[in-house]
């Protein structure tokens, strides 16, 4: 009933709650003396379904048979229409259409932790569209039955608030859920389990790790667990890895030795627990413990390379370079590098510790046989030293690799290729490909890069420290015992026309010809490896095409003679530079008039 219904009644048969597809009879009847004031025969009763008229009848009552009602609630309202007045609401009724509950499926119960409470979940099946009450029952030992009702509209979970205790862990419990509404009831199949089946332990806590004698090989993981835990799973991984190592342990009693950890590595550790070998479920994983393993002495050997530079008749400069050990080889924080320089015949030795960088430069006599040894040290010890005999790396011409070429290979890569030396190629023990940014001054502070290649290789892809639009001086060394031969080439990974031309800084007259001097183009404006310079000249105020002279680019060259100028004629001169991608714009213009006699 939806209002006071003073004027009449609406009755619904067989019930206000019906099964989907059922028919209902709705009767609207006026109470005595509640019809139209003068003309009771003119009473017009109208039945509305929500706001839509579905039936009407003249008289004191109206009967209507209604079919095809949808799931859910439908509102019917009966109104009275009298002549010359608005319709008056008589009464109304709501009809609830639904279905009986389906049998609840997949009932399962769990207790989180030995101190937790039992909660069960199930699948309700299709919506009944009616108020449906769920009652969960749990029968256990000691002739007790627990029961709880769910008042939620969509109920598929109930927590009993009961903590099962392990007095008899093998005792059986039986759970059952029953759904009841106005159209029927249905019970799930019973679910039978023991304490051990449904208790899911809490995850382990208070996880710690200890390294005995600060050694990675003597490592024990400790944790705390609930009292009944029998099994543990451990998983651990380096913090930068996605793959876990897994270990299963039985009766660990809160400790386990780990034997395969890598030194000086941050690991993440997690543990899970279970009460029984084949019953019950694993706990969630514990919170992660992150810990760094102790250092061990370095393994592996440093990759060492060197450069020799002539200073004067008695002295030479040696620059040593080495690469960092990989993390797995360093096995700790490298505190310093130890460099030992020794004259092999006289036995004189000098040792120095280098911190903070991976190069060392010294000056030694040009006489004598020199060797160096370089090792890396952490808090636990040193790597095996890498020994190198200092020799003239390019002295053996017959060992020089042939037909060296350098070609761009995608973004910031250069493919270097060569042919074996003329001398017996089988004598080559290894090739070293070295590259550094080309600096016109031959600056020794420019970082040096190198890679080693096996003797049967005739190419190498260089990608480390390669920048676009920079020219690199590339050398390929063939090493054989105490001899070496080398070839060099210039190369870039990407190039375009230079951004500017050379700046002419002086023009001088010498015996009827001129010498033009210029400043090198700044490295950042060269845009790759320069191939040529061009010198242009033409008579001042002339419209004729300029003449030009093309000079192959050489790193150290910054002057060039021209002897085809006429005396006492004023010329305008300028220069450009070329890479494989094209020619630069003009450099500055200079005027010059040769003073020499006319022919």
């Amino acid at each position: 009933k939806i209002d006071a219904c003073k004027r009449g009644d609406v009755t619904v048969k067989p019930s206000h709650v019906i099964l989907l597809g059922s028919t209902v009879n709705i009767t609207c009847s006026l109470k005595p003396r509640q019809g139209c004031f003068h003309y009771s025969r003119r009473n017009k009763l109208i039945l509305y379904k929500f706001d839509r008229r579905i039936n009407f009848h003249h008289g004191h009552s109206l009967n209507s048979q209604v079919t095809g009602l949808p799931l859910g609630t439908t509102l019917f309202v009966c109104k009275l229409a009298c002549i010359n007045s608005d319709e008056i609401q008589i009464c109304g009724a709501e009809i609830f259409v639904g279905v009986a509950p389906e049998q609840p499926q997949n009932l399962s119960c769990i207790q989180k932790g030995e101190q937790g409470t039992v909660a069960c979940t199930w699948e309700r099946g299709r919506d009944t569209h009616l108020y449906t009450e769920y009652t969960l029952q749990l029968s256990g030992p000691k002739n007790l039955t627990w029961q709880k009702q769910c008042k939620d509209i969509y109920c598929d979970y109930l927590d009993f608030g009961i903590n099962l205790t392990p007095e008899s862990p093998e005792s059986n419990f039986t759970a059952k859920v029953t759904a009841v509404n106005s159209l029927g009831s249905s019970s799930s199949l019973p679910s039978t389990f023991t304490f051990l089946d449904i208790v899911r332990p809490l995850p382990p806590w208070d996880i710690r790790i200890k390294f005995q004698k600060a050694s990675v090989s003597r490592c024990t993981l400790y944790w705390r667990d609930e009292g009944l835990v029998l099994l543990n799973r451990l998983r651990y991984r380096p913090s930068n890895s996605r793959l876990w190592n897994m270990v299963n342990v039985t009766k660990a009693k809160g400790r386990h030795d780990l034997l395969d950890l890598k030194p000086f590595t941050e690991y993440e550790f997690q543990i899970s627990s279970k009460l029984h070998l084949y019953k019950g479920s694993w706990s969630d994983w514990s919170e992660s413990l992150r810990a760094q393993t102790p250092e061990e002495e370095p393994t592996g050997m440093l990759d060492v390379w060197y450069m020799k530079r002539h200073i004067d008749y008695s002295r030479q400069q040696i620059s040593l370079f080495w690469k960092n050990l990989s993390v797995s080889e360093a096995r700790g924080k490298i505190l310093h590098y130890q460099v030992t320089l020794q004259e092999l015949t006289g036995g004189k030795a000098m040792t120095q510790n280098i911190t903070g960088h991976t190069s060392w430069t010294t000056v030694i006599p040009r006489t004598g046989n020199w060797a160096v040894a370089v090792s890396a040290a952490n808090s636990k010890g040193s790597s095996l030293p890498t020994r190198i005999n200092i020799m003239n790396l390019c002295e053996a011409g017959l060992l020089a690799p042939r037909q060296v070429s350098a070609n761009s290979e995608g973004m910031d890569n250069i493919l270097v290729t060569w042919q074996p030396p003329r001398k017996d190629p089988s004598a080559v023990q290894e090739y070293v490909v070295e590259w550094r940014e080309l600096h016109p001054g031959g600056d020794t502070q420019v970082p040096l890069n190198w890679l080693r290649s096996r003797p049967y290789n005739v190419s190498a892809l260089i990608s480390e420290n390669i920048k676009s639009y920079i020219c690199y001086e590339i050398r390929v060394y063939a090493l054989s015992g105490d001899q070496g031969g080398c070839s060099s080439i210039l190369g870039n990974s990407k190039h375009k026309a230079p951004l500017s031309g050379p700046h002419i800084n002086a023009i001088t007259e010498e015996k009827g010809s001129i010498l033009i001097s210029w400043n090198s183009i700044p490295v950042q404006e060269q845009m790759g490896c320069l191939l040529h310079y061009r010198i242009y000249w033409k008579e001042r105020d002339s419209n004729s095409q300029p003449q030009l002279c093309e000079i192959p680019y050489r790193v150290s060259q910054n002057s060039h003679p021209i002897n085809s100028l006429q005396p006492r004629v004023t010329y305008v001169l300028w220069m450009t530079a070329l890479t494989a991608a094209g020619e630069s714009s003009h450099g500055n213009e200079r005027e010059f008039c040769l003073q020499g006699k006319a022919n």
Epitope: T117, G140, K142, L144, W146, Q147, K148, Q149, D159, F160, G161, I162, N163, L164, T165, E167
Partner: nanobody
């Protein structure tokens, strides 16, 4: 002073129904477990039913599906509705209150876990 007072007992024919009430005073029992026990001469008190503070009902299997326990926290009163009574249900029925809402499964059925007791009300089922 805490008091529990039972009422509603009496003589009833087998198959009949009775509703026992337990009115509490002196403290609020809405957060406590409340239980009904019964005792016949010469025997120990036997657990009948309990209702926890989370409204979980607990029944002895002998009365399951026949008895229903409920509570009205606003009135601080607890009820035991008994249907289909049998001759063996004849006993003095006691209302008992817990100090707090324990959740351990072992405490509901043990009289020693209930510090508060009523005086009892006699239920007699005749043939």
């Amino acid at each position: 002073q805490v008091q529990l007072q039972e009422s509603g007992g009496g003589l009833v024919q087998a198959g009949g129904s009775l509703r026992l009430s337990c009115a509490a005073s002196g403290r609020t029992f809405s957060k406590s477990t409340m239980g009904w026990f019964r005792q016949t001469p010469g025997k120990e008190r036997e657990f009948v039913a309990a209702i926890t503070w989370t409204d979980t009902e607990v029944y002895a299997n002998s009365v399951k599906d026949r008895f229903t326990i409920s509570r009205d926290n606003a009135k601080n009163t607890f009820y035991l509705q008994m249907h289909s009574l049998k001759l063996e249900d004849t006993a003095v029925y006691y209302c008992a209150g817990d100090r707090y809402g324990s959740s351990r499964d072992s405490v509901f059925s043990s009289p020693t876990n209930y510090p508060y007791w009523g005086q009892g009300t006699q239920v007699t089922v005749s043939s």
